[in-house]
Interface confidence: low
Amino acid sequence: MLSHAGPARFALFLLCCMETLLPSHMAPTHRLQPSDVRKIILELRPMSKGLLQDYVSKEIGLPESNHSSLPCLSSDSQLPHINGSAILPYFRAIRPLSDKNTIDKIIEQLDKLKFQREPEAEVSMPADNFERKNFILAVLQQFSACLEHVLQSLNSGPQ
């Protein structure tokens, strides 16, 4: 179980990582090709942006979360892979307060990137109103940034 203290600092600390850096017991049961990962990210990207824009428009004045804390890409030159297992709990946690249909579609896509042998942690939302808003914003901002980083890397690498 993951706590929710300091959401902007730790949110999605495992959001993106290198598939090659994972221990063997966490490796996906089916290895996705770069083209498949790219296709999933291209589907996730507009949904993620839309959710973020919608949320920011409702919540003017919230501080921007710190993207630099997100270990999205490794310096390793091999295929970057989004760790669906790490992201899914956060999207499940923010589900109640986000667009129902969009979140379901995001979860459906993330499920394809899940490391299937890895147990999924459960994340709870902060009880404090302001912290909750920051938590949601951090998840959406850092997820959008992560997608951009991974997409850039995939675009610059072999297809």
């Epitope: 179980m1 499940r92 923010i94 109640p96 979860i107 999924e120 709870s124 949601i136």
Partner: antibody
């Protein structure tokens, strides 16, 4: 199609215990929070308990806390409500409900009747 | 605990009428610009059915004559043109905080 099938409702004496079961199908059960909601005969709806999708978090109203326990078995797609120290005012139809996250209750089972009477 | 007060407790209307049911919360049930208020319909002898979630979102399969609005403490369920099959009891419910609470219900009869 989403289906929620409750069972375990019965006639029980005050102070007695009962365990309700709800078997879910037609959706990825482990992705959803689940709740129990009850309705006394001829009365309105009352929320009884909620459990998060992974089972780590449970929530109850004060009049239920300590007497009822909600639990789930994701491997069996099953939700439970263990009811102890039953009172006559617990008499109601108990509905198993799928939650959307911790929020909207979007699918309801047919309900199971619990009668607490001496 | 957030108290939910629905009005009216009952009403009778004719097919084609525009019907409005209101729900007032004892404190704000909005969060992040969204009203965490939901509306359910329960027909006699049937199970409750979700109509509107988060104040204004129409649940899939629900006729477009149903709509929801409101924020903060005041919310409204509107049926734009009443149909005979709309005879039911309607409940509002908040999920802003635990314990989740329902309104006492509004019984709608068709003349």
């Amino acid at each position: 199609d989403v289906q929620l099938v409750e069972s375990g409702g019965d006639l029980v004496k005050p102070g007695g215990s009962l365990r309700l079961t709800c078997v879910a199908s037609g959706f990825t059960y482990s992705n959803y929070g689940m709740s129990w909601v009850r309705q006394a005969p001829g009365k309105g709806l009352q929320w009884v308990a909620t459990i998060s999708y992974g089972g780590s978090y449970t929530y109850y109203p004060d009049n239920i806390k300590g007497r009822f326990t909600i639990s789930r078995d994701n491997a069996k797609n099953t939700l439970y409500l263990q009811m102890n120290s039953l009172k006559t005012e617990d008499t109601a139809t108990y509905y198993c409900v799928r939650g959307y996250g911790y929020d909207t209750m979007d699918y309801w089972g047919q309900g199971t009747l619990v009668t607490v009477s001496s | 605990e957030i108290q939910m007060t629905q009005s009216p407790s009952s009403l009778s209307a004719s097919p084609g009428d525009r019907v409005t049911i209101t729900c007032k919360a004892s404190q704000s049930v909005s969060f992040a610009g969204t009203g965490l208020m939901h509306w359910y319909q329960q027909k006699p002898g049937k199970v409750p059915k979700l109509l509107i979630y988060r104040a204004s979102n129409l649940e899939a399969g629900v006729p477009s004559r149903f709509s929801g609005s409101g924020s903060g403490t005041d919310f409204t369920l509107t049926i734009s043109s009443l149909e005979p099959e709309d005879a039911a009891t309607y409940y509002c419910q908040q999920s802003r905080e635990y314990p989740w609470t329902f309104g006492q219900g509004t019984k709608l009869e068709i003349k």
